[in-house]
């Protein structure tokens, strides 16, 4: 008789999840000499230990602490790029501007990027059928808690000027419910972080509006300044040209506003 299995509203664990995590870990540690000491089997064991045999709606940050410890990594604290709802451009940017880092450029972020995972209470099985959805099921699910934990630690490590890339095409350019708005903003340390600089990325080719005047950006400014962190906002009118100018800053067309 097949055992009854909880049906969740979200997609199930990404297929070949253990193999993917292990392979990513090996690849990352080969590319990044400073992480060569990492034992990828131990990393996978710690990752698995965070959610296997646990109720997928009852995961805590504490569950991920062994993994956090193994994945401890020092990135230059003044070279951090946060993003919200514009991951691809942020990643394209750090691929060109190699001295800047998104969370997904760190080992732990790289391991979990675009993956889904969950287990089941009291069994060692991974649930490939369904996993809890943050809204419809529960917020304390393995994926959400993981990203909350690593995002908090990433923000806490930041210093000097922190940049954030925001999607100017969305109705809420700054969304208080995003990971950036609910976790990272509140974990920047005013003693270390002087300024948060927002880059608002325009979508339309003819969009010449000053999106730094958007009410949600002013809301972000208010939250940040109340935390004794200074705020700066810049429009990136032409993201394609922006990336091109990061690649070739000497290009004569790169002196004008992008």
């Amino acid at each position: 008789v097949p055992r009854w299995r909880q049906q969740w509203s979200g997609p199930g664990t990404t297929k070949r999840f253990p193999e993917t995590v292990l392979a990513r870990c090996v690849k990352y540690t080969e590319i990044h000499p400073e992480m060569r000491h990492v034992d990828c089997q131990s990393v996978w064991d710690a990752f698995k230990g965070a959610f296997i045999s646990k109720h997928p709606c009852n995961i805590t940050e504490e569950d991920y602490q062994p993994l956090m410890k193994l994945g401890t990594q020092t990135v230059p604290c003044n070279k951090i790029l946060l993003w919200s709802r514009i991951k691809d451009l942020a990643h394209q940017f750090t691929q060109v501007q190699r001295d800047m880092f998104t969370l997904e450029d760190t080992l732990l972020g790289y391991l979990a990027d675009d993956l889904t995972w969950c287990g089941e209470f009291n069994t060692s099985k991974i649930n490939y059928q369904s996993c809890p959805d943050w809204r419809k099921d529960c917020s304390n699910n393995p994926v959400s808690v993981f990203w909350k934990t690593v995002s908090r630690r990433f923000a806490e490590a930041a210093c000097d000027v922190v940049h954030v890339m925001l999607n100017g095409s969305r109705s809420k350019i700054f969304d208080k419910n995003s990971t950036f708005g609910s976790v990272e903003v509140h974990n920047l340390q005013p003693e270390k972080v002087q300024t948060l600089e927002a880059w608002v990325i325009h979508g339309g080719r003819e969009d010449s509006r000053d999106l730094c005047q958007d009410p949600t950006i002013k809301e972000l400014e208010s939250i940040i300044s109340k935390r004794n962190i200074q705020f700066s906002c810049k429009n990136i009118y032409r993201p394609d040209k922006f990336l091109q100018c990061v690649k070739n800053p000497e290009d004569s067309s790169c002196t004008s506003e992008i």
Epitope: K218, N228, Q230
Partner: antibody, heavy 119, light 107 residues
């Protein structure tokens, strides 16, 4: 280029009022904050107030009850209304632009306007 | 209010000398410190922000160091055009407060 020009200074009797203006060009008041800083003759710098791009304000407690900072974005002008003036308010008053959207230090200053409070 | 104390209040040095001005805050201001230069009869000019960051266009002979409560402005090789009064300013807390100034002259 970025410029700030103060006006409205002059000789005023104690107890009277004066309104200083700071006309800005080369940047928008909807993007940057503007501070007022004063300097008594032969003395150091003293911060008075700031008005941020959204119109919110912060004051030094020493001036909060007598001075009011305001702005008119359409006229690209920031104002400092000074009431109940005293002899010790005699100073050069500078307006200055914040370097970024909302920061507490300034990169471009006006040339200053002298206010003399004397009977 | 946070008190900012500069020393010395004035100094005289020769062209080419290394000049150091110190600024102490009455409480921890982390790295929220700016340095300004004011020439006689002129408005102040921003030199350094964030305790160590050189403002664009400022000669590289100027540098800032320190964090917490003790800060230093250094002119590595004094030039005649550096004759001015130098002010530190904290921006950790309102009211913003300035040091009393250090007057730099050429011997």
């Amino acid at each position: 280029q970025v410029q700030l020009v103060e006006s409205g200074g002059g000789v005023v009797q104690p107890g009277r009022s004066l309104r200083l203006s700071c006309a800005v060009s080369g940047f928008s008041l909807t993007n940057y904050g503007v501070h007022w800083v004063r300097q008594a003759p032969g003395k150091g710098l003293e911060w008075v107030a700031v008005i941020w791009r959204g119109g919110s304000t912060d004051y030094s407690a020493a001036f909060m009850s007598r001075f009011t900072i305001s702005k008119d974005n359409s006229k690209n002008t920031v104002y400092l209304q000074m009431n109940s003036l005293r002899a010790e308010d005699t100073a050069v008053y500078y307006c200055a632009k914040t370097t970024l959207t909302r920061v507490w230090y300034v990169d471009v200053w006006g040339q200053g306007t002298l206010v003399t409070v004397s009977s | 209010d946070i008190q900012m104390t500069q020393s010395p209040s004035s100094l005289s040095a020769s062209v080419g000398d290394r000049v150091t001005i110190t600024c102490k805050s009455s409480e921890d201001i982390y790295n929220r410190l700016a340095w300004y230069q004011q020439k006689p009869g002129k408005a102040p000019k921003l030199l350094i922000y964030g305790a160590t960051s050189l403002e664009t266009g400022v000669p590289s002979r100027f540098s800032g160091s320190g964090s917490g409560t003790d800060f230093t402005l250094t002119i590595s090789s004094l030039q005649p055009e550096d004759v001015a009064t130098y002010y530190c300013q904290q921006y950790w807390n309102t009211p913003l407060t300035f040091g009393q100034g250090t007057k730099v002259e050429i011997k």
